[in-house]
Every structure is written in structure tokens, then in C-alpha cells.
Interface confidence: medium
């Protein structure tokens, strides 16, 4: 049984997709697409602010962890990368770039350094780090 | 500028995609799509033969590494996972499930155990392992 007709404008032909298969995206070219979210890992080391600016310039934001189920690919990510989580000293909370507060039990926060920014590490860990320290970073774009 | 009209049959409406964005796939539901290849990481530990059978049952194969550029997402994979690489004792070569020989300089083969199967480890390393040892595994499906 086939469904989901995809109009491929490049070749102007119909491609048939089995019910169990689907397209993912849309995402920026050569980004990773998973459960209709787009991710890209950047090798160059930048501080948190530069990393944020780099993601924004690509119409994305630094990684936001919102669901262990929908983002289970993050379990297997090696090393440490800036994500969009910052510490608000006034109330002691951790919040994402969009202003939302970090949900309980999503990340294990580990105080590696003194700082107000957080690195993502495998198995849903967040390592506190000084925001001016250069690190690799993960950009994310949520599809509509 | 917008292009690539996508016919969304679910809502029967047109979604416009910017030129710099694209859909990836098709892939099995909830698989990772990257540069039009589909990947899935399986948590349950199986031996190499069971892992191969699991991938085949999903119309896929165990991971084949064919390009550091097209598969650079594999750089950051944590831990060790079965891939579709086996040792042919008669001629000493390493070959993929499809019969093709491992290209030089794609993987650094490290003999950590006695065996004729290989685990994928981050940064394009292959760890030799006994084929009957249970490990997690990576399935891959190349899109047409």
C-alpha cells in the first residue's frame, strides 16, 4: 500500500513512498533531520555568544532540549557542545534562549566550571561553563 | 525567493520551502536523515548476525561507511556499535555486507578483541570484535 504523494519539482515526477516511510524537514541543506527537527554540529570553537550569533545567522537557535523521547538521538552525542541554556542569577533558574524555563528531569546539570552557560554532553547532561570559553556548538531549527 | 512546492496530502495544502532548505528522505518513520541517507541507532544489544537480521527486517543494512564527507555526522557518535563490516580470513580483507571492500583511509581498524566483525567507534574507527558478542548497532538505508 502506498500513500503520501510527493511532488518532486526538480524532475516533475511523482515519487511514491510506503506508508512506513516519510520525508523529514524541511531543513537547511546538509543538516540532520530527526523527528522533524533540524540539527547541525559545528566544529569550530566559539564562545556562547558567538555560537548563538552563528545559529541565528542561519535562522536557527542553539540546541534546546525539550523532550528525551523526541530528541533521543542526543543520547549518543560525543563530547561537549554549547546549547541554548543560560543561568539567570537573579532567580537562580536555568532558561532557554526563547525565555522558557528548563523543565525538571530533562537534563542533569553538572557544575564543571563557574559560569552561566551550559554545554550539552551525551545522555542528557548539562555542564556549566564560563560563557566566554570557546567550544563547539549545536544549532537547532524546529520545523513548522 | 521560494521554490520546491511540497504537496502535503494530509492537509491538502501547499507548503513553501526556501531555496536553501530541503526535505530529506524518504526514511523509515523516526529514523535520522542526513544527506539523504537514513540511520537508526538501536539500544538493544545483539550479536552481529542478529543485528544484521534486525536491519534487514527493516529493509536496511548495518552501517556502511563510504564517505567521511557525506557521513561526517558519524564523527560524533558515542560508544561502540555494530556496523556491516566483516573480515574475510581467506584473503585478510575487510568487506561490507554488499561485498564491497573497505576503502583505504576510511576507517582506522584497531584490533581490540579477537574476531571477524567490527564495531563502529567515533571519529571513523573500527574496533575488531568477536561476532557473537552482543552490542548495540546502527542500521542504515540509502535513499534512491
Amino acid at each position: 500500500i502506498w500513500s503520501a504523494v510527493f511532488l518532486n519539482s526538480l524532475f516533475n515526477q511523482e515519487v511514491q513512498i510506503p506508508l512506513t516511510e516519510s520525508y523529514c524537514g524541511p531543513c537547511p541543506k546538509n543538516w540532520i533531520c530527526y523527528k522533524n527537527n533540524c540539527y547541525q554540529f559545528f566544529d569550530e570553537s566559539k564562545n556562547w555568544y558567538e555560537s548563538q550569533a552563528s545559529c541565528m545567522s542561519q535562522n536557527a537557535s542553539l540546541l534546546k532540549v525539550y523532550s528525551k523521547e523526541d530528541q533521543d538521538l542526543l543520547k549518543l552525542v560525543k563530547s561537549y557542545h554549547w546549547m541554548g541554556l543560560v543561568h539567570i542569577p537573579t532567580n537562580g533558574s536555568w532558561q532557554w534562549e526563547d525565555g522558557s524555563i528548563l523543565s525538571p528531569n530533562l537534563l542533569t546539570i553538572i557544575e564543571m566550571q563557574k559560569g552561566d552557560c551550559a554545554l550539552y554532553a551525551s545522555s542528557f547532561k548539562g555542564y556549566i561553563e564560563n560563557c566566554s570559553t570557546p567550544n563547539t556548538y549545536i544549532c537547532m531549527q524546529r520545523t513548522v | 525567493i521560494w521554490s520546491a512546492v511540497f504537496l502535503n496530502s494530509l492537509f491538502n495544502q501547499e507548503v513553501q520551502i526556501p531555496l536553501t532548505e530541503s526535505y530529506c528522505g524518504p526514511c523509515p518513520k523516526n529514523w535520522i536523515c542526513y544527506k539523504n541517507n537514513c540511520y537508526q541507532f538501536f539500544d538493544e544489544s545483539k550479536n552481529w548476525y542478529e543485528s544484521q537480521a534486525s536491519c534487514m527486517s527493516q529493509n536496511a543494512s548495518l552501517l556502511k561507511v563510504y564517505s567521511k564527507e557525506d557521513q561526517d555526522l558519524l564523527k560524533l557518535v558515542k560508544s561502540y556499535h555494530w556496523m556491516g563490516l566483516v573480515h574475510i580470513p581467506t584473503n585478510g580483507s575487510w568487506q561490507w555486507e554488499d561485498g564491497s571492500i573497505l576503502s583505504p583511509n576510511l576507517l582506522t581498524i584497531i584490533e581490540m578483541q579477537k574476531g571477524d566483525c567490527a564495531l563502529y567507534a567515533s571519529s571513523f574507527k573500527g574496533y575488531i570484535e568477536n561476532c557473537s558478542t552482543p552490542n548495540t548497532y546502527i542500521c542504515m538505508q540509502r535513499t534512491v
Epitope: - | I110, Q113, K125, Y127
Partner: antibody, heavy 123, light 107 residues
Framework: QVTLKESGPTLVKPTQTLTLTCTFS??????????VGWIRQPPGKALEWLAL???????RYSPSLESRLTITKDTSKNQVVLTMTNMDPVDTATYYC???????????????WGQGTMVTVSS | QSVLTQPPSVSVSPGQTASITCSGD??????VSWYQQKPGQSPVLVIY???KRPSGIPERFSGSNSGNTATLTISGTQTVDEADYYC??????????FGTGTKVTVL
Amino acid sequence: QVTLKESGPTLVKPTQTLTLTCTFSGFSLSTSGVGVGWIRQPPGKALEWLALIYWDDDKRYSPSLESRLTITKDTSKNQVVLTMTNMDPVDTATYYCAHRTGIAVAGIAFDIWGQGTMVTVSS
Amino acid sequence: QSVLTQPPSVSVSPGQTASITCSGDKLGDKYVSWYQQKPGQSPVLVIYQDTKRPSGIPERFSGSNSGNTATLTISGTQTVDEADYYCQAWDSSSLYVFGTGTKVTVL
């Protein structure tokens, strides 16, 4: 001739972070297959592997200590640095760095070890 | 976590053979290395890949590994062989694992 030498504080207070440096000579940590590992040994007890860094900057950690450890390398200075956070008196040990042979078939062996540095954790 | 179990101590007379065992689940499927550590000194690799000796290690040191047990054998044991000995293996879950250690006493 391959040599390695560990350096760092001999005394750290509980909850502090330990930083150890391994300075080596006789090999390059950019040669394919090569790695440098850290192993510790509490007084009168067995060896315990902590971490390893490969030539390609791939890092491996003991699963039980992974959240506390960071290993880095400076190829130009021929140095490998291990940091261990939240030190506790049970972390009192001699800390060794060791060269992981570049021979593929001897992949699990540490063929040359440093002299070790004793670290005491006490307030 | 993998566990490699060694006898705490082995006693041997000079010139006799000392055998040190290292036990672990399906250890014969893995490569085993052995290290010698004399008091106040760093460990020295004496056997790697079950049976191979690094250059400079005397021929009296040999290794074997099958089933669940690896064995380090010192033939014609000398007083200079008095030391602690550790086996070591690797697996994809625990990575580099050392044995519990065996003290060899040459009587």
C-alpha cells in the same frame, strides 16, 4: 625512547578540582593509532583506568567516573591534561599516565608508563 | 562493569614455575595484557595480546588465554620476579579493565 612524566598538586582539598599534566617525549600524539591514558592506584590497591585520548582527539572515559573527568591534549607541547572535579578522600591515589601502543594488534596495552604522582585528598 | 578476578597471592620457590590466573566472563574472547609492578615503581607491560612479549621481557614470562581464564606463567622464577601482577582486558562497555592484582612471593 618514549618517556612520560606526570605533574600536578600533591595535596587537594575535598570538593576541589584536580588538574594533572602528562608531559611526554619520544612519540607524537598525532601519529595514527597512538593514545595516552590515565590510570590511578590507591595506596595498597589495584590499578584503575580513568581516561584515554587518541591521536584524533577522540576521548574515552571510565563509565563510573565519566561525569567528573575531562581529558585534553596539546600536541604542540607534547602534553595531555586530566581534570577531575569534586575530589574526595577516596580519590587519594598515585596517578599514572601511560602510552597506548600505536600497534593496532596490541590495541589494549599500555606499553610505557610514567613514574606516577601521588595525590592526597584531605582538608 | 566487567570484573577480572585474580588470586590475592601466589608463593613460589626460586627456579619453580609460578602461575597467576585471571578470570572473567568469556575472557578467552578478549585480548589480555599483563603488567608487573615492583614496590614503589610503575607498572611494566610483560605480556600483550594474550601471549606476546614486548622487547626486553625475559622468555620465562609467557601467557595463555582460553575459556574464562587467562594465565601468566613465570618459568624458572627468580627473586627479581617478586612483584604485584595485574591482568587487563578491554570490552565495549567497561573499556579498559584491570584485574584485582596478585602478589607473587619468591620464597
